[in-house]
Amino acid sequence: FPTPGPLAGDSKDDATSNSLPLTSANKVEELIKYILGKISALRKEMCDKFNKCEDSKEALAENNLHLPKLEGKDGCFQSGFNQETCLTRITTGLVEFQLHLNILQNNYEGDKENVKSVHMSTKILVQMLKSKVKNQDEVTTPDPTTDASLQAILQSQDECVKHTTIHLILRSLEDFLQFSLRAVRIM
């Protein structure tokens, strides 16, 4: 892993920061922000290289990926906040995203280092969050069939479908992490 250095939010464009913020006082928050910075860089690259800039809700509905998202029942919002339920749900969601990131890493045609960085730091984040969850058995393992359908999409010959899917995974992970960041701050 890169050695600790400037935090993700400290440079002119935090998306290009190459150091994991391992010395931060609030490591979970800083790590989430670090990953968000990397996702920003990847989305910018998708936009510049593959002209994949806009969200396509239609494509999201079509590809049937069932990407994790936080809902009211997950206890992560101001109303009905439940720290234990929320931490469990965030951790489970990130475990699911890890599978997607693993496949994405093998199929991404741009900056593989950034994808690898997102994947590895998400893995670290999962471990950090798991250590805060009281009942670790509640952190469920994702369904491997989702994995297979994603693998098929990303190995598709249709470049547009492939790029749209990658864009959607990054956009969904970004949304998930932004909600997670708010939830962590409120604790």
Epitope: G9, D14, F77, Q78, F81, V184, R185, I186
Partner: antibody
């Protein structure tokens, strides 16, 4: 929603002061809280933040090590313990409720702190 | 630390006009930005959070937009009660700094 600050006044340089903020009209323990200050004829300056269960606490660099934010959820009260006060700490101090995004959706009327000999 | 640069520092406008205040961040703040209005001798009031979400009770003539490092607050058809100072604030990485403020005066 009502936030009422108290504890302001005249303090000597190097002295201490504890500000309180009494909250009512909402479930205090569900919200993060901020302290913000405003020097006379100046802009707003964020001072400190505390999460609902006090797990998350942040300070501005200008007050780090001198000020301590805390809360008493059963008593619906937010505190700001200020030590080693300097003339540049002279300001109106506001407590504010944090919404889900961290933004301050409700503010108190403020309490004035003057640091002078 | 992320710095927020607000512009203009002051502006004069007439009732009915449309004005735009901008806030530039020194780094990407991922839409973690709020706008406040403060009238002389009063506490600030939240107008917009999450860069573009209007706070409860705020008139629809106010709107926030932007992303990355560039954000703006637009006020359509200025009303007499809109005059005062406006501040942006980010919630990305601590310290959660405010912009220097914009004083909006009646022409």
């Amino acid at each position: 929603v009502k936030l009422q600050e108290s504890g302001g006044g005249l303090v000597q340089p190097g002295g201490s002061r504890k500000l309180s903020c009494a909250a009512s009209g909402f479930t205090f323990s569900r919200f993060g809280m901020h302290w913000v200050r405003q020097a006379p004829e100046k802009g707003l300056e964020w001072v400190a933040y505390i999460g609902r269960g006090s797990s998350t606490i942040y300070y501005a660099d200008t007050v780090k090590g001198r000020f301590t934010i805390s809360r008493d959820n059963p008593k619906n009260t937010l505190f700001l313990q200020m030590t080693s006060l300097r003339s540049e700490d002279t300001a109106m101090y506001y407590c504010a409720r944090s919404n889900w995004d961290g933004a301050m959706d409700y503010w108190g009327q403020g309490t004035s702190v003057t640091v002078s000999s | 630390d992320i710095q927020l640069t607000q512009s203009p520092a002051s502006l004069s406008a007439s009732v009915g006009e449309t004005v735009t205040i901008t806030c530039r961040a020194s780094g990407n703040i991922h839409n973690f930005l709020a706008w406040y209005q403060q009238k002389q001798g009063k506490s600030p009031q939240l107008l917009v959070y999450n860069a573009e979400t209007l706070a409860d009770g705020v008139p629809s003539r106010f709107s926030g937009s932007g992303s990355g490092t560039q954000y703006s607050l637009k006020i359509n058809s200025l009303q007499p009660e809109d005059f005062g100072s406006y501040y942006c604030q980010h919630f990305w990485s601590t310290p959660w700094t405010f912009g220097g403020g914009t004083k909006l005066e009646i022409k």
